[in-house]
């Protein structure tokens, strides 16, 4: 309705004597700003005067405020939106209707708000979930329809009158929609909390009691049980009787069924609170408990361990491990069912009693072949002695023993010979199934344990064999002592250390890596010509003409070996320089003349310099100097200089003659 003023605020506000009221309020006037505001208590419209009568708690006009209860009642609003009010302190006789009389330039409005002030602080209200189950977290809510900025309060939770340890979360609301204070407590109740009283206590800022609300907890839980047994230690002998009783200490709701379990499995036809076991057997030993159910679920008692005692049963022997490896450790375990556990054991090896062995386990730290055989045992407890079982067999395994490699050939062995070797051994468990040879090669094994090396290599120094069952036993290596011609013959320059320059003293060494036998002879050759018979070849002053391909030979009684050809390179400064001319030393003007600087040098010339007949430097660096077009005045003697890393060399003068062309002669 566009003819109404629009207000928003809580419909009713609650407080008590001496507290305060905070009234959150918003409005929208029909036109313009608020010009006059009066707060009435229980206003009544007077038709005669066309005005409202009633107690004026607050007044604000264009002319200014009229003092009444202005200190107690405060208008905290403004001229267009906010109409929030505060009454502090609030009294019992403030209960009733508050009337907000609003006037703008052309419009008027009366807005009514209910105020409920009680004599004493009213109690909060506890809200519980519809059902509470043990160990399931629930939220307890305590709600109070009150909140005021000028009157701080607190809500505290108590269980059976004792403050609760859990942290509560308190929230307040002071909005146009609602005014309240709320405390929420998260809580995981146990079955023992069933029937206990929970209190939410309203306190002032100093912790002084104002009011409270209480509820009794109804905690649904499975039955809680106690089990009793006769005899109390639950230890009996075969043939004795046992009684177990189940007692319910708490159940919510009431229990519905009873059952008994042994080792987690339900016992058939046992549905009463008493379990009677007559003439028990050893099979009835185990863990017993009773189970009682209600609508929440089953509850179980603690377990009772019933022990039925009996003499040892026939024993068996377990070996860790068989077959056993020689040198390893072995453990024998005597296994016999008995209650109480056996206190004494007697051990037998191949039917003969083992002295001093009375424990459940026998440990042999280092097994030897003679430990093999049958092991058995007898167990004994307070109720009697058991029987000796069938026993267990220990197999002791070991690698082949005393392995040797034997050379079948006559000595000495030469490179290229065929060598036969055999692999022998003394004893083995299990049997030898294969042989290995070191080093590995593409060798023939004509029969088990025999090796044939065709065309034996110079470097076949030693051979070893292994006889293998589950393990391999290696023999000591045998030396073949193969004889061969000198190997890896090569020429090595020992002087100078750097590159060879013309005029240097040069020494070449003939090296080889090995020879057997060691006695050797040397030969040097260049281009098929014998030069010397020493291990070194020496040049006092090397010349470029000594450059070439050198080889050396080394022989012993087995044969002779040559080196790879070694190139001797002699470095020298450019020499034999000359200037050649193309197309010739006589050229017609206007044509092209190319001067080439020819030389012999090692390394080759890296840099050329050109000069004319007056030794003036020409701006060229390459081997060729090109004059195009050539002129008559270019006639003259030219020379070049060649440079390499060793030094410089210069050519003699070469004369270029440039003659006039027919055209020039014709013009003269």
């Amino acid at each position: 309705d566009s003819s109404k003023w629009v207000f928003e605020h809580p419909e009713t506000l609650y407080a008590w004597e001496g507290a305060c009221v905070w009234i959150p309020c918003t409005y929208r006037a029909l036109d313009g700003d608020l010009e006059s505001f009066i707060l009435f208590h229980n206003p009544e419209y007077n038709k005669n005067t066309s005005k409202f009568d009633g107690t004026r708690l607050y007044e604000s006009t264009k002319d200014g405020k009229v003092p009444s209860e202005q200190k107690r009642v405060q208008f905290l609003g403004d001229k267009n939106k906010n109409c929030t009010l505060s009454i502090h302190p609030v009294h019992l006789n403030d209960s009733g209707q508050l009337g907000l009389r609003m006037e703008s330039k052309t419009e008027k409005w009366m807005e009514r708000i209910h105020l409920n002030v009680s004599e004493r602080p009213f109690p909060p209200h506890i809200q519980l979930p519809p059902e509470i189950q043990e160990s399931q977290e629930v939220t307890l809510t305590c709600l109070l329809n009150f909140s005021c900025y000028g009157y701080p309060i607190q809500l505290q939770w108590l269980l059976e009158g004792v403050p609760m340890r859990q942290a509560a979360v308190t929230s307040t609301s002071l909005t146009i929609k609602s005014v309240f204070t709320r405390s929420e407590l998260k809580f995981s109740p146990q079955w023992s909390h069933h029937g206990k009283i929970v209190t939410c206590q309203l306190q002032d800022a100093d912790g002084k009691f104002l009011s409270n609300d209480t509820v009794q907890l109804n905690v649904k839980h499975t039955p809680k049980l106690e089990i009793k047994v006769t005899p109390s230690d639950a230890i009996v002998r075969e043939g004795d009787s046992v009684t177990m009783t189940c007692e319910v200490s708490s159940s919510n709701p009431e229990y519905t069924t009873v059952s008994w379990l042994k080792d987690g499995t339900s016992l058939k036809k046992q549905n009463t609170f008493t379990l009677n076991l007559r003439e028990v057997t050893k099979d009835q030993s185990g863990k017993y408990c009773c189970q009682v159910s209600n609508d929440v679920g089953p509850g179980r008692s603690e377990e009772v361990f019933l022990q039925v005692q009996y003499a040892p049963e026939p024993s068996t022997v377990q070996i860790l491990h068989s077959p056993a490896v020689e040198g390893s450790q072995v453990e024998f375990l005597c296994m016999s069912l008995a209650n109480p556990l056996p206190t004494n054991y007697t051990w037998y090896h191949n039917g003969k009693e083992m002295q001093g062995r009375t424990e459940e386990k026998v440990h042999i730290p280092k097994i030897l072949p003679w430990h093999a055989g049958t092991y058995s045992c007898v167990a004994e407890n307070i109720l009697g002695t058991g029987q000796r079982g069938p026993g267990a067999e220990l197999d002791v395994q070991y690698p082949p023993k005393k392995v040797t490699t034997v050379i079948q050939n006559p000595m000495p062995i030469r490179e290229g010979d065929t060598v036969t070797l055999s692999c022998n051994y003394n004893s083995s468990n299990p049997s030898v199934t294969r042989y290995e040879w070191k080093p590995h090669g593409a060798w023939e094994e004509p029969s088990l344990g025999v090796l044939k090396i065709q065309n034996v290599g110079w470097d076949n120094t030693t051979i070893a064999c292994a006889a293998c069952n589950s393990w391999c036993s290696w023999a000591s290596p045998v030396a073949l002592n193969v004889q061969y011609a000198p190997r890896d013959v090569r020429v090595r320059k020992i002087k100078p250390l750097s590159e060879i320059h013309s005029g240097n003293s040069v020494s070449l060494q003939c090296d080889f890596s090995s020879s057997h036998p060691k006695e050797v002879q040397f030969f040097w050759e260049k281009n098929g010509r014998l030069l010397g018979k020493e291990s070194q070849l020496n040049f006092d002053s090397i010349s470029p003409e000594d450059a070439g391909s050198y080889s050396c030979w080394v022989n012993n009684s087995i044969g002779q070996t040559a080196s790879k050809a070694w190139t001797l390179e002699v470095l020298y400064a450019p020499r034999r320089l000359r200037v050649s001319m193309s197309p010739g030393d006589q050229v017609m003007e206007g044509k092209s003349a190319t001067l080439t600087c020819e030389s012999d040098a090692n390394p080759p010339v890296s840099h050329y310099t050109w000069f004319d007949w007056n030794n003036q430097s020409l701006p060229y660096h390459s081997q060729k100097l090109r004059l195009e077009p050539v002129k008559v005045q270019h006639s003259g003697a030219y020379w070049c200089q060649g440079t390499n890393s060793v030094g410089k060399g210069r050519s003699p003068l070469s004369t270029l003659t440039v003659y006039y062309s027919p055209e020039t002669i014709g013009r003269r």
Epitope: H607, T609, F611, D612, W613, N614, Q616, S617, L618, P619, Y620, H621, S622, Q623, K624, R626, L627, K631, Q633, H634, G636, Q641
Partner: antibody, heavy 125, light 111 residues
């Protein structure tokens, strides 16, 4: 301080001859430790050496193979200057033309580096 | 005669170092130690910065250095400054019928 001052027209018609002059101050065109060069620059061809002249016991000149046959470099010793003549020009010859000196660095060693340059002449064909 | 190959552009921040490469053949860069480097600002003539691979003319900052390996020469500018922004050209003596060859040029930008 050696300076090279260039002169010559900035606009030449196709098929005509381009003539540029380079006046030397602070050095002599007759120096036997210098070469006197012409270099041009265009966006399409970049920097391009065209030719040089130098005096030793007599006068020598060299030309780039790309212009050989239509180029000549002449010297006027009295004015201490050298010039470039490029015949039968085409729009391809458009660019900035520079004269430059190359100097013998020590004794007989040429650095082949242009240590002094003219201000350049922009020639449009 | 083909021009020597240079990267079209290189950039660096003030204070940084940059290197410009110049690749030729065994007939030019690889065959002779006559590589030179030039700096050219827009509208100006080239200026010699390095000659004979690694020599600096007097008046050129020691921030500029040159080197050569095989057929490739390099110009390194250390402690880059705003005024170094320019085009850079390499040049080499060559044994072909034209004795000099220049590089394609590299534009240096100082960020």
């Amino acid at each position: 301080e050696v300076q090279l001052q260039q002169s010559g027209p900035g606009l030449v018609k196709p098929s005509q001859t381009l003539s540029l002059t380079c006046a030397i101050s602070g050095d002599s065109v007759l120096s036997n430790s210098d070469t006197w060069n012409w270099i041009r620059q265009s966006p399409s061809r970049g920097l391009e050496w065209l030719g040089r002249t130098y005096h030793r016991s007599t006068w020598y000149d060299d030309y780039a193979s790309s212009v050989r046959g239509r180029v000549s470099i002449n010297v006027d010793t009295s004015k201490n200057q050298y010039s470039l003549q490029l015949n039968a020009v085409t729009p391809e010859d458009t660019g900035a033309y520079y004269c430059a000196r190359d100097r013998l660095q020590d004794g007989n060693s040429w650095s082949d580096a242009f240590d002094v340059w003219g201000q350049g002449t922009m020639v449009t064909v | 005669q083909s021009a020597l190959t240079q990267p079209a552009s290189v950039s660096g921040s003030p204070g940084q170092s940059i290197t410009i490469s110049c690749t030729g053949t065994s007939s030019d860069v690889g065959g002779y130690n006559y590589v030179s480097w030039y700096q050219q600002h827009p509208g100006k003539a080239p200026k010699l910065m390095i000659y004979d691979v690694s020599n600096r003319p007097s008046g050129v900052s020691n921030r500029f250095s040159g080197s050569k390996s095989g057929n490739t020469a390099s110009l390194t500018i250390s402690g880059l400054q705003a005024e170094d922004e320019a085009d850079y050209y390499c040049s080499s003596y060559t044994s072909s019928s034209t004795p000099y060859v220049f590089g394609t040029g590299t534009q240096l930008t100082v960020l």
